[in-house]
Amino acid sequence: EPTMYGEILSPNYPQAYPSEVEKSWDIEVPEGYGIHLYFTHLDIELSENCAYDSVQIISGDTEEGRLCGQRSSNNPHSPIVEEFQVPYNKLQVIFKSDFSNEERFTGFAAYYVATDINECTDFVDVPCSHFCNNFIGGYFCSCPPEYFLHDDMKNCGVNCSGDVFTALIGEIASPNYPKPYPENSRCEYQIRLEKGFQVVVTLRREDFDVEAADSAGNCLDSLVFVAGDRQFGPYCGHGFPGPLNIETKSNALDIIFQTDLTGQKKGWKLRYHGDPMPCPKEDTPNSVWEPAKAKYVFRDVVQITCLDGFEVVEGRVGATSFYSTCQSNGKWSNSKLKCQPVDCGIPESIENGKVEDPESTLFGSVIRYTCEEPYYYMENGGGGEYHCAGNGSWVNEVLGPELPKCVPVCGVPREPFEEKQRIIGGSDADIKNFPWQVFFDNPWAGGALINEYWVLTAAHVVEGNREPTMYVGSTSVQTSRLAKSKMLTPEHVFIHPGWKLLEVPEGRTNFDNDIALVRLKDPVKMGPTVSPICLPGTSSDYNLMDGDLGLISGWGRTEKRDRAVRLKAARLPVAPLRKCKEVKVEKPTADAEAYVFTPNMICAGGEKGMDSCKGDSGGAFAVQDPNDKTKFYAAGLVSWGPQCGTYGLYTRVKNYVDWIMKTMQENSTPRED
């Protein structure tokens, strides 16, 4: 507990102090006081530097004194032989004696009293920034007019903080400007503009005079600008050392003016204004900005339009342009959007054709469609080459975005038929010689495939069975072979409107307009054993002349069998119609004169007994195309005959091309259109 005074005596005082003793006293007086310690008696063994016995006075870490020997007062009016004055309120006294004393020493007597200290004058460091006032046991600081004492109760400063400037234009100066600014002050000014405006500070060099930096370059008084995480300054010296125009890129600016105790100058004056926040003119590849300006500021809106072949992809939606707004933070909205090359995507597949997997599907890439040759060709031209266009579509120079269409090649057998002598008088044939040949099992008959969806046959074949089962692709017609071939399912049968339907078809004598079309449910896949025959053209080139040769094929009656198991074929010449009229009907169902002969019929045969017969009906009479010798067209359809092995009558297909085309067009699926 601190005391105001006290007495300290060496051990056994006034008797001789013992050897080998060490004793210490901790003196403490109240805060705000110093200590006056004085000795009235001192008798301690003398030694050099008081090495043997001593009394030591310590203040903090400092040894104030070390005493030994005998002392007497110099002043007859005062008993004090030694004294110490410390401005601190704590002191330590330590007495030490060694192992022997040559004489008898009595030690010491000392007293301490608390003394007032003058904090205003007694210390090197002045405790108050301005006025210091001492009193017994303490001191207090005070300030000149217009200054106030800070919370530390030592420093005075001016009340220059707390101002908030919100106007878009203004002027700020240091306190008392242009008179010297207050020392020991921290002035903070806040500029707060609405979002979207940046604070721009302008100064003139001559409007700035602040205490210069020390030798290390540190400002003693300083002016600092803080905008978010950016700092400008500190600035000091005579004449403004920084940029005279500071664009802060922020709508909030803090101005901090810090001064020390010395060296006041006239200070500073600045102007500020709010600029709409600028947004950088960014380099956005593959695009153009509208409007084009040298500088863009807050609330400016630009339309960024992608160059041809580029698009902006947001989610799953592709667009060719987007809008971007200069925002209050100086950044563009939609800045993540970029003009990327248009991606046309994986090209659509096409029926009966293919497209190689493209290396790239981006703008400018090229792909090539091909048809499954030699069975299909590209009907709608264009060469099959498509490039990825700017609108994201695969585009062909001729067709535009329309896909190529692979349609069956007609009239080209994979293997040409080599005539052999055995149909009637015909030869064995392979389905590859007549890939258009269709087999009808009920009634046992034939037909000709003319495209993916249509079979041409004789009307008398389908008049009694409107849901015929048909097969393609097989040379032989045993059940097991047909099971391995392609069965065709009819969707609808179209009999020529000129064909007269009879209640008793067996007694028919009029085979005029003996033609029908069968629409298939599903398209036929073409290949070496299945391929259509061409239709005749409408020009006079397709008018048959006597002696023109044609091929017939079928599984009809032969010399040895009622029905052939393996496909038979023969080459026959066209004959004058009268040749057919002259042949006696084998098993007439009516008077010979009742049989009708019309220009819709072709007469053929009569050579080497080669002829079609029962079971061959509906099959094609195939003639070489006069304009393309590699192709065959269906000039006729096996219709009827007076007698097998002589002449036969065939429906003249050329006369029905318009009806065939019209029927097919009116009954095509949308996919075919």
Epitope: E415, Q421, D428, D430, K432, Q478, S480, R561, A564, V565
Partner: antibody
Amino acid sequence: QVQLVESGGGLVKPGGSLRLSCAASGFTFSDYYMSWIRQAPGKGLEWVSYISRSGSTKYYADSVKGRFTISRDNAKNSLYLQMNSLRAEDTAVYYCARDETDYAFDEWGQGTLVTVSS
Amino acid sequence: DIQMTQSPSSLSASVGDRVTITCQASQDISNYLNWYQQKPGKAPKLLIYDASNLETGVPSRFSGSGSGTDFTFTISSLQPEDIATYYCKQYEDYPLTFGGGTKVEIK
């Protein structure tokens, strides 16, 4: 008159190869489908292979598939049977036959004996 | 594969006798059946096609019938020159298969 003459038979070790030939005369060879039929000693007939007129279509019995190859040369009026990887069970008289029409063999050769033995 | 079962495997009959051989297919073969005659040491000879049609030049004492799976070959009056082995053959599907044969002898 129609004649079919087989040749090329003989003794061969298992795993060996032989090529049989059939020379046709007296008819237009290219008009007809042709077949090979074999008959093991004291056994019945076994159809081996068949070829179409142009040679584009061929069929084989399961027992010879992958080992035997039928071919024809219409210009030379000849039918062939290349036999590889022969086994003891391939020992037989091999006949070539003309397929008159619809799988009926109307003309046959006299046959050639193939013996597979070590 | 279609199996052809022929019976009997052999028979002995007198000259002038009616001889009947049967052939059964393991599945329906319609009328796609031939009958062949093979005399000892000779190549086979076609007698019947399409189950019932007589090949040109074949004596009329030979006949065939049947459809589907069951077929019959008949020699109406056995002659000494008819001594041979008779085979049926199906051509409904590949592989073409023969019956095991019926050996006909004269008593």
